[in-house]
Interface confidence: low
């Protein structure tokens, strides 16, 4: 057995470009030829332990054999040269690992960033995968000095080992090298100060102003390389519950600053702020956003009076009436602060006024049958709203003028109400509504609409398949006008139960059927029509359709002395429901008739 290899494969470390051809040779040593009684024609080539077809092999001379591979695609192949010693025993001569891949692409999109307080980081696009060990080296130099090379661990970025020097241009490029080639990116030339990403501003604080309820003052601390850089800011804000940010115009924050007053805000509203910074020239990178900070604008007096209405309770005596004044709490956007109380002033004709301070949203007063004017204002710690004024006429005055063409219809899960205004100028409209039920009283909700409105939706939480009684009242300077009402459904359904039919009168050949209207709680919609199905035990079923205004119907052409089964169904726009089955028998003879 020879200790030295019997021969060698050349090249010893083959690296092939994918898709190309490759030839290797195996050269046997003279001593080997004599020891094993062989020559190059005894050589067997193998890839990954599988014999290479003979057509790929060429015997060059007695010591040398070559093998050629076309269109190499496997990333790694174990290539061995073997001999058939003494004509039959296979002996390994030498082996190499053949690698395939691509030369590096020219790196592109080279960019660098100097994160404040850290060294410079450069990134690039290395291009296609090489499938080979490829070294990427970030090179950098001044016009007069070379900096240490940066060997990339990942092949797409490298952080240099030296601290950046500002206000001196640096040239940077990337060299990529593997066994198949070496290539360099385009170089980029820049001043590192123009690539700075500052640390985020910090200690952001927000303060409000008693004088102006529409502003908040911000202050913060900027780093900017310890004051070496002038930074401009980007400020964004949102209300506490909003998800989208509002941008302060960048032109307002272009000059270096550490404070700013945000204007045009809503009173008594909590806002959240964040801020970031960049070099004032706009070169470099925006910092990350600062930690968020919040503040609440100062209160302002309520921006409008509450919605205001009244109800007169039935009066037992003739001289007085009980009047319940009612109003709605202002939404936060109009209250502009915490409402402390409401001021109600009642004036009888032009005589003495009575003032009430109320913390709730209603006030019941006993009034004579004279005409009164009521005014209502909401108060917070800054001041009072404008007053809502309501005339309460004498009960002897008949209300004139009401809305016309009143309609209601569901759309987009809302119940809409529409009307034509009366011919006289209106101050406002009051809409009232309640669920009609035979099991519970009609508990009214209400809302106020401006004089210009003639279409709106009910703003309460409405239920499906409930019948709503809706009333619209125009309000004039002299008092309320006439009220118009209608019924409507947010969404109809099939009735909860069908009608229970009975016989009112049965004759030899006809029967009068009667039924009660389905209670409003079970109707679930507008009853449009009924169907009556009737049959004998052996005959086919007959069906008649009856208008919903009827509560009885006469079946004719019946057979005498016959048992009939009857059932009724009621239909809304959304479907029908059967009532219970009822049976009756026609007599054998008509009244006074003898067999």
């Amino acid at each position: 057995q020879l200790l030295e290899p019997c021969g060698y494969i050349y090249p010893e470390f083959p690296v092939v470009q994918r898709g190309s051809n490759f030839t290797a040779i195996c050269v046997l040593k003279e001593a080997c030829l004599q020891h094993y009684y062989v020559n190059a024609s005894y050589i067997v080539w193998k890839t990954n332990h599988a014999a290479v077809p003979r057509e790929q092999v060429t015997v060059i001379n007695r010591t040398t054999s070559s093998v050629t591979f076309t269109d190499v695609v496997l990333p790694s192949v174990q290539l061995t040269c073997n001999i058939l010693s003494f004509g039959q025993i296979e002996q390994n001569v030498y082996g190499v690992t053949m690698l395939s891949g691509f030369p590096p692409d020219k790196p592109t999109n080279l960019t660098c960033i100097v994160n404040e307080g850290k060294n410079m980081l450069c990134q690039w696009d290395p291009g296609r995968e090489t499938y080979l060990e490829t070294n990427y080296t970030l090179k950098s130099e001044w016009a007069t000095e070379k900096f240490p090379d940066c060997q990339s661990k990942h092949g797409t970025s490298c952080m240099v080992s030296y601290m950046p020097t500002y206000y001196v241009n640096i040239e940077v490029w990337v060299e990529a090298e593997n066994a198949l080639g070496k290539v360099s990116s385009e170089s980029i030339n820049f001043d590192p100060v123009d690539k700075v990403k500052p640390t985020p501003p910090y200690n952001l604080s927000v303060t409000n102003s008693e004088e102006l309820s529409s502003i908040l003052k911000l202050s913060w601390v900027s780093s900017g390389l310890g004051g070496l850089l002038d930074l401009k800011s980007d400020i964004q804000y949102r209300t506490k519950d909003a998800s989208t940010w509002i941008q302060v115009p960048l032109e307002d924050t272009m000059s270096p600053r550490t404070s700013f007053t945000v204007q045009d805000l809503k009173p008594f509203t909590e806002y959240v702020f964040r801020i970031r910074s960049i070099k004032d020239s706009g070169k470099g990178y925006w910092s990350d956003w600062s930690e968020e900070a919040s503040g609440t604008t100062y209160e302002d007096r309520p921006s409008r009076p509450p919605s205001f209405w009244y109800k007169t309770n039935p009066s037992h005596g003739q001289e007085y009436r009980s009047v319940r004044l009612i109003w709605k709490a202002l939404p936060l956007s109009e209250a502009n602060g915490k409402i402390l109380d409401y001021e109600v002033i009642l004036t009888q004709s032009k005589s003495v006024s009575q003032t009430y301070t109320v913390t709730g949203t209603e006030l019941t007063v006993n009034l004579t049958n004279d005409r009164y004017v009521a005014s209502l204002a909401a108060r917070n710690k800054v001041g009072k709203s404008a007053a809502a004024v309501l005339t309460i006429p004498s009960p002897h005055v008949t209300a004139a003028y009401s809305v016309v063409n009143l309609k209601a219809f569901p759309k987009d899960n809302l119940l809409w109400v529409e009307w034509t205004p009366p011919p006289k100028p209106v101050s406002k409209y009051i809409l009232e509504w309640c669920v009609l039920s035979e099991n519970a009283p009609c508990v009214e909700d209400w809302q106020q609409e401006d004089a210009t409105v003639n279409r709106t939706h009910l703003r309460g939480r409405l239920l499906e398949s409930k019948c709503y009684q809706i009333t619209v009242t125009p309000v004039f300077a002299t008092g309320p006008g006439g009220s118009e009402s209608l019924k409507a459904y947010l969404k109809q359904a099939a009735p909860a139960r069908g009608p229970t039919v009975r016989t009112k009168k049965v004759g030899k050949n006809e029967a009068v059927l009667a039924w009660d209207q389905i209670p409003v709680d079970d109707q679930n919609g507008f009853i449009r029509n009924y169907s009556i199905s009737y049959r004998t035990s052996v005959g086919k079923e007959m069906v008649v359709h009856v208008d919903s205004s009827h509560t009885e119907y006469t079946l004719s052409s019946l057979s005498s002395d016959t048992l009939y089964m009857v059932r009724m169904a009621a239909y809304t726009d959304e479907g029908g429901k059967d009532g219970p089955e009822f049976t009756f028998t026609t007599p054998k003879f008509a009244q006074g008739e003898i067999e």
Partner: nanobody, 125 residues
Framework: QVQLQESGGGSVQAGGSLRLSCVIS????????MGWFRQVPGKEREGVAA????????VYADSVKGRFTISQDSSKNTVYLEMNGLKLEDTGMYYC??????????????????WGQGTQVTVSS
């Protein structure tokens, strides 16, 4: 084996002229970028001029613009540097360099792999 051989250096009076030559051998001349660089003792080697042998594009350092001209003769695999209006500060060792790895003309010395031995230029008053 890539080889670069400079010639044409020498001594000259301020305001005079010289023509440096650089002959390249050992690789395909067509795919090459050629540059002239100079070095004064105690200072970094600086780029003077460069040319793309394929397209003929050129670039010059600001200090030599209008005075120096880089050119080529591809039939002789040679690059020239014509130096007119020489100044005292033009004194130094002039090197010819070649690059096969770049794709645009540059006088960035870090992108050139192959260098000649240099030729001395001395400008006196």
């Amino acid at each position: 084996q890539v080889q670069l051989q400079e010639s044409g250096g020498g001594s000259v009076q301020a305001g005079g002229s010289l023509r440096l030559s650089c002959v390249i051998s050992g690789f395909t001349y067509k795919q090459t970028f050629m540059g002239w660089f100079r070095q004064v003792p105690g200072k970094e080697r600086e780029g003077v001029a460069a040319i793309s042998t394929g397209g003929g594009n050129t670039v010059y350092a600001d200090s030599v613009k209008g005075r120096f001209t880089i050119s080529q003769d591809s039939s002789k695999n040679t690059v020239y540097l014509e130096m007119n209006g020489l100044k005292l500060e033009d004194t130094g060792m002039y090197y010819c360099a070649a690059s096969t790895v770049i794709t645009s003309v540059t006088v960035n010395r870090g992108l050139y792999q192959y260098w000649g031995q240099g030729t001395q230029v001395t400008v006196s008053s």
